[in-house]
Interface confidence: low
């Protein structure tokens, strides 16, 4: 089963202190990349139990293996179904926690009910706040059954479900009629897919006999152990305050696992931690009881004492769950409950035993899942035990499963089952990814999806020049970091492949597919210098530069000119794509701007050193607009324009430009120069009779200035069609200039 635990902190009087934490003991859990599996998800499931909307809950990730949900603001936020999803691929597993309001009218005597197929399930809702109304039972949010309030037995409403089948699984609730759903008692019914003690597709396989309240998984036959127990059959107790499949997790806080509810993958469901009981998991076990929810009884014999976390603690000379076995009976010692090997390896497995008479080599045997019996190849005899060593033939996937070490002497026999997991070394499904390249190095992301089993312990990158027969170069890297391949040849293609390894002997997988990565061309080394520049207008600049003379061909594809406008914080880049070019015209610049200018040689994507910068000030733009423009028709073909000079001129005006356009016309406007800037009047001739015209004008110094306001005027009536407008300035009657 997936090592996934959902913890609920049950100190409930202040919802803001309530939290749910999902912890994964899976290798590489929750990192969220293709290679390392999808992330842990922890959320409230509002499909069945809907609560009033509140502020969004806060999700905090603590590393890759833990996610916590906080931010509950009111009691009703807590009521309902929460789920955590973890594990990758076919192992993706959902763990469910059902939360009941401690102030509800009805409370479940037991929230989680795990039953076998065909059993009778009995759900019991205890009256907490009595209402003299019917009780409605629902299954997965739909009406199921009604009980009259007189039908309460000993202050409890019971729902009996005979001959349950897996589809009966789900969330059940008991609610007083017309009461808020938040006052319901919520239950979770888990129906195993097989009858008691059986598992597998046809329920033909026998469960291993899970101890200490462990539940046999109906799909894979593994024991899902209660919090605080470990081992193939949950035979081993964790130290107080620890949980997880290998006891690797620790309960938060100084009071250990008090006040915490633990939810594990189905078919286990939820319970208090070992040594605790009660609806809030805050009550210690009564004397003689131990384990999750204090469901187990010690019944210690031969002077054993009951520990509420681990069960019977046996005096010297005795062992067994109830201290019922004399140390004279042979006993398998310190056998790991789970071993992991890589496919096609030939591991050695040790099995140690003690007893009186003393076990010898021939009295210890190892049995594989297919029934094959292996005899030990050698034994190490020590004063207190005999250790038999077994050489296992080359492992195949079918060897995964429960193995058994058995010792037999005249004093009796003992056996210990343990799980062997045969893992497939990982093989990359994709080539590594090129992140950046330079002329002598490549930066590569080795993180790729893979087939086979994690966790990934090492990543090897193999690389060599393309089409080369030389040996591959190899670099061992951290699985989560990018790799820089150094000291490469410029402008060269390299074949790059990833090899992944998992822990243990024989954990190296096959090489992944190759990819071609090419180093960049060499960096250009020549530094140009700016020979000069010339302002060709308020927004135009001609720049020229030179390069030092060096022997051999020029390493470069062109030049990059950079203009930096410090006032506006803007950079302009101009690409000159010929390496022979030594001059460029820059247009569209901002008049009146102070630019810093430099030039660089480029080759492929690489830039050479920049020239020493030059500082260029473009002249400001043209003058302000002429003032008080006025138009007056003189005849059927002439209109006189008058104006006043612009104010605050930066220099002498060189000319005016008049724009003429027929009002409402679709044609382009006509521009007419007034070359005598001292004038403040001009006559536009050659206009059409009875036609409405639009006029505006602007002045020019080094550049054209702003347009004046637009004025309208119509020529006088019924003249002949003119050839087109012309203008005449006062005191310039002969110099017509179209």
């Amino acid at each position: 089963a997936v090592d996934l635990t959902l913890l609920a902190n049950l100190r409930l009087t202040d919802p803001q202190r309530f939290f749910l934490t999902c912890v994964s003991g899976e290798a590489g859990a929750g990192r969220g990349s293709d290679a390392w599996g999808p992330p842990l998800l922890l959320e409230k499931d509002d499909r069945i139990v809907r609560t009033p909307p509140g502020p969004p809950l806060r999700l905090a990730r603590n590393g890759s293996h833990q996610v916590t949900l906080r931010g509950f603001s009111k009691p009703s936020d807590l009521v309902g179904v929460f789920s955590c999803v973890g594990g990758a691929g076919a192992r993706r597993t959902r763990v469910i926690y059902v939360h009941n309001s401690p102030g509800a009218h009805l409370l479940p005597d037991k929230v989680t009910h795990t039953v076998n197929k065909g059993d009778t399930a009995v759900l019991s809702a205890r009256v907490h706040k009595e209402k003299q109304t019917d009780v409605i039972w629902k299954s997965n949010g739909s009406y199921f059954y009604t009980l009259d309030w007189h039908e309460a037995q000993d202050g409890r409403f019971l729902l009996q479900l005979p001959n349950v089948q897996p589809p009966s699984s789900g969330i059940y609730s008991a609610t007083y009629l017309e009461a808020s759903p938040l006052g319901s008692a919520f239950f979770r019914l888990i129906v195993r897919g097989c009858g008691a003690g059986r598992w597998g597709p046809g329920c033909t396989k026998e469960c291993p006999g899970c101890l200490h309240g462990g539940v046999c998984h109906d799909h894979d036959g593994e024991c899902v152990c209660p919090p605080g127990f470990t081992g193939t059959r949950c035979e081993q107790a964790c130290r107080e305050g620890r949980f997880g499949q290998s006891c690797q997790e620790q309960c938060p806080g100084i009071s250990g696992c008090r006040g915490l509810t633990f939810c594990l993958p189905d078919p286990y469901g939820c319970s208090c931690g070992s040594g605790w009981r009660g609806s809030q998991c805050q009550e210690a076990c009564a004397p003689g009881h131990f384990g999750a929810d204090c469901r187990l009884q010690c019944q210690c014999q031969n002077g054993g004492t009951c520990d509420r976390f681990s069960g019977c603690v046996c005096p010297s000379g005795w062992h067994g769950v109830h201290c019922e076995k004399s140390d004279r009976i042979p006993q398998i010692l310190n056998m790991a409950s789970e071993l992991e090997f890589n496919l096609e390896t030939m591991p050695r497995i040790n099995c140690a035993a003690a007893g009186n008479p003393f076990p010898v080599r021939g009295s210890i045997e190892l049995r594989k899942p297919d029934g094959t019996v292996l005899l030990s190849t050698k034994a190490i005899v020590e004063p207190e035990k005999t250790t038999a060593e077994f050489e296992v033939p080359r492992l195949v996937l079918a060897d995964s499963g429960f193995w058994e070490c058995r010792v037999s002497t005249s004093g009796g026999q003992d056996s210990r089952r343990f799980k062997v997991n045969v893992k497939v070394p990982p093989v990359p499904l994709a080539a590594p990814r090129l992140l950046t390249k330079q002329s002598r190095q490549l930066v590569v992301s080795p993180l790729v999806s893979f087939s086979g089993d994690g966790p990934i312990s090492t990543v090897r990158l193999h690389y060599r020049p393309q089409d080369s027969t030389m040996d591959w170069s190899t670099i061992v890297v951290d699985p989560s970091e990018n790799v820089t391949l150094m000291n490469l040849r410029p402008k060269t293609g390299y074949s790059v492949r990833v090899q992944l390894s998992r822990p243990g002997e024989g954990g190296e997988g096959a090489w992944g597919p190759p990819t071609l990565m090419t180093t960049d061309c060499p960096e250009p080394l020549l530094q140009p210098w700016l020979e000069g520049w010339h302002v060709e207008g308020t927004d135009r600049l001609r720049v020229s530069w030179s390069l030092p003379l060096v022997p051999g061909p020029l390493v470069g594809d062109g030049f990059l000119l950079r203009l930096w406008d410090g006032t506006r914080g803007q950079e302009r880049r101009e690409n000159v794509s010929s390496p022979q070019a030594r001059t460029a015209l820059l247009t569209g610049l901002t008049p009146g701007t102070h630019y810093q200018l430099d030039v660089q040689l480029y080759h492929c994507t690489l830039l050479g050193p920049a020239s020493p910068p030059a500082h260029v000030l473009l002249p400001p733009s043209g003058p302000p607009a002429p003032r008080h423009l006025h138009a007056q028709a003189l005849s059927d073909s002439e209109i006189q324009l008058t104006w006043k000079h612009p104010e605050a001129l930066p220099g002498p005006i060189s000319k005016y430009v008049v724009e003429v356009q027929v009002a409402g016309g679709a044609g382009d406007p006509l521009w007419i120069d007034v070359d005598r800037p001292e004038e403040t009047s001009t006559i536009i001739r050659g206009l059409n009779a009875s036609t409405r015209y639009l006029f505006r004008m602007r002045a020019s110094i080094q550049g054209l200035g702003d347009w004046s306001n637009t004025v309208e005027e119509s020529t006088l009536g019924n003249g002949l069609q003119a050839e087109g407008p012309v203008q005449e300035s006062r005191a310039a009657e002969e110099g017509l200039d179209q």
């Epitope: 100190r11 409930l12 009087t13 202040d14 009033p52 509140g54 502020p55 603001s73 009111k74 009691p75 009703s76 401690p102 102030g103 907490h128 706040k129 009461a179 808020s180 938040l182 006052g183 009660g278 609806s279 809030q280 805050q282």
Partner: antibody, heavy 117, light 107 residues
Framework: EVQLLESGGGLVQPGGSLRLSCAAS????????MSWVRQAPGKGLEWVSS????????YYADSVKGRFTISRDNSKNTLYLQMNSLRAEDMAVYYC??????????WGQGTMVTVSS | DIQMTQSPGTLSLSPGERATLSCRAS???????LAWYQQKPGQAPRLLIY???SRATGIPDRFSGSGSGTDFTLTISRLEPEDFAVYYC????????FGPGTKVDIK
């Protein structure tokens, strides 16, 4: 600042009715269960009634069941207590309180209800 | 319903002394759902302790609560002048109910 302000108290004859209001401010009223608690002159505290955030779940002390009705208007941040068939033993200072849940962490200043002929 | 009793009815002490107030429930209070309040004349009650032992926001650490099941205690480690008042306990495991109160006055 979190505040509760009761109003609506006064003098009423036995058998009469009165409606108390409690205006809440400084917190998200619609997230909290609210309650009424009363205190007869010179006596201890007595819980009267509570209402859950949605308003759908209400409950009452046996002494007022059937006569008093608690309600709330979350859009107005206001809690109400409709008191009918008032008796002499209902005379008390009525406090509105925020419920966290069960323990009352914020109280109003109280409003006096006098039942006398 | 659960009945709450408090003892003593009045406790006469001097500033600086330790005050121990008792509260007993007629039946077990589920999950230690018990609160303590302080009330001064003409004022509304003020929450001191909830969940039997958790101090409410802004309450000085000289106030502490303990107990479970049916027996609960409020301790004021060192009485300050402003601590002389009436103290009520309240259970909220079922329909809420208050104790009759203990008056702490100056000796």
């Amino acid at each position: 600042e979190v505040q509760l302000l009761e109003s609506g108290g006064g003098l009423v004859q036995p058998g009469g009715s009165l409606r108390l209001s409690c205006a809440a401010s400084g917190f998200t009223f619609s997230h909290y269960k609210m309650s009424w608690v009363r205190q007869a002159p010179g006596k201890g505290l007595e819980w009267v009634s509570s209402i859950y955030p949605s308003g759908g779940w209400t409950y009452y002390a046996d002494s007022v069941k059937g006569r008093f009705t608690i309600s709330r208007d979350n859009s107005k941040n206001t809690l109400y207590l409709q008191m009918n068939s008032l008796r002499a033993e209902d005379m008390a200072v009525y406090y509105c309180a925020r419920d966290r849940p069960g323990a009352f962490d914020v109280w109003g200043q109280g409003t006096m209800v006098t039942v006398s002929s | 319903d659960i009945q709450m009793t408090q003892s003593p009815g009045t406790l006469s002490l001097s500033p600086g002394e330790r005050a121990t107030l008792s509260c007993r429930a007629s039946q077990s209070v589920s999950s230690s759902y018990l609160a303590w309040y302080q009330q001064k004349p003409g004022q509304a009650p003020r929450l001191l302790i909830y969940d039997a032992s958790s101090r409410a926001t802004g309450i000085p650490d000289r106030f502490s609560g303990s107990g479970s099941g049916t027996d609960f205690t409020l301790t004021i480690s060192r009485l300050e002048p402003e601590d002389f008042a009436v103290y009520y306990c309240q259970q909220y495991g079922r329909s809420p109910s208050f104790g009759p109160g203990t008056k702490v006055d100056i000796k």
